[in-house]
Amino acid sequence: ESGYAQNGDLEDAELDDYSFSCYSQLEVNGSQHSLTCAFEDPDVNTTNLEFEICGALVEVKCLNFRKLQEIYFIETKKFLLIGKSNICVKVGEKSLTCKKIDLTTIVKPEAPFDLSVIYREGANDFVVTFNTSHLQKKYVKVLMHDVAYRQEKDENKWTHVNLSSTKLTLLQRKLQPAAMYEIKVRSIPDHYFKGFWSEWSPSYYFRTPEINNSSGEMD
């Protein structure tokens, strides 16, 4: 049987909602960029459905996405990164829905990594540091980071701090003594590119010292 939809399938397809969203990752693998798209409705029957990007490409008119389970994916050096491309959901040669998108406005950075917290006894503070692969990149170098931390027992009571550097100091007196904290960080493009928050880094856990009764300070 052909991989293309029969006429009846096409009529059914036109009744479905093929809304989709995409994000780009620039220089995600050396000089290669990636583009990932997925349907907003997880129940869409993706059999026979393909994604294609046309325009604002180098040396080619269009590129087809690879399908990886429920997502559609391209990794290539061929994005011009200037102007708008047309991204379409297709059945055979028929386009079901399309979006004109500038790939530099849907950038999702890579998640920060190597998050750690060091307690400085003399300074009575915690120095939070993390790393990002974007420091080495040509394009998406400037990021805003969101550091979120909470006392482990407070399920949804996250405190957020926005910063542009990869180092943050938390004052000991702002934290509860003898408590276990969870901390994590994510990034979003800032200046020159637009887009979405990265995935969260893996969480790091640290314990605050107990209060020293004689001085009223933490040990």
Partner: nanobody
Framework: EVQLVESGGGLVQAGGSLRLSCESS????????MGWFRQAPGKEREFLAA????????HYSDSVKGRFTISRDNAKNTVYLQMNSLKSEDTGRYYC???????????WGQGTQVTVSS
């Protein structure tokens, strides 16, 4: 109704420099790609340089790479083409274009003449 206006052209000696400007009255300028082209007498219009909406990404034709620089000022709705080490073959009418959508430029200016004398 004029939406793109080029300026800065003129007569210059070989080896000299010129800076072209293109002012846009299009409301979406700050989110649009911009490009520069030229048309030499009796020849087709050729692409020279393009710049993304924020100025972070630029692209040049081999014929001008290293000599021409494209830049933009989104606060002034203006794109520039700095042209150095000009040659007689750079003579022509220079056009700016705005909003590159699926390989088609949506808006064009009327052009400004550049003549390089040897």
């Amino acid at each position: 109704e004029v939406q793109l206006v080029e300026s800065g052209g003129g007569l210059v000696q070989a080896g000299g420099s010129l800076r072209l400007s293109c002012e846009s009255s299009i409301s979406t300028f700050s989110s649009d790609a911009m490009g520069w082209f030229r048309q030499a007498p009796g020849k087709e219009r050729e692409f020279l340089a393009a710049i993304g909406w924020s100025g972070a990404v630029t692209h040049y034709s081999d014929s001008v790479k290293g000599r021409f620089t494209i830049s933009r000022d989104n606060a002034k709705n203006t794109v520039y083409l700095q042209m150095n080490s000009l040659k007689s073959e750079d003579t022509g009418r220079y056009y700016c274009a705005e909003d590159y959508v699926t390989d088609v430029w949506q808006y064009w200016g009327q052009g400004t003449q550049v003549t390089v004398s040897s």
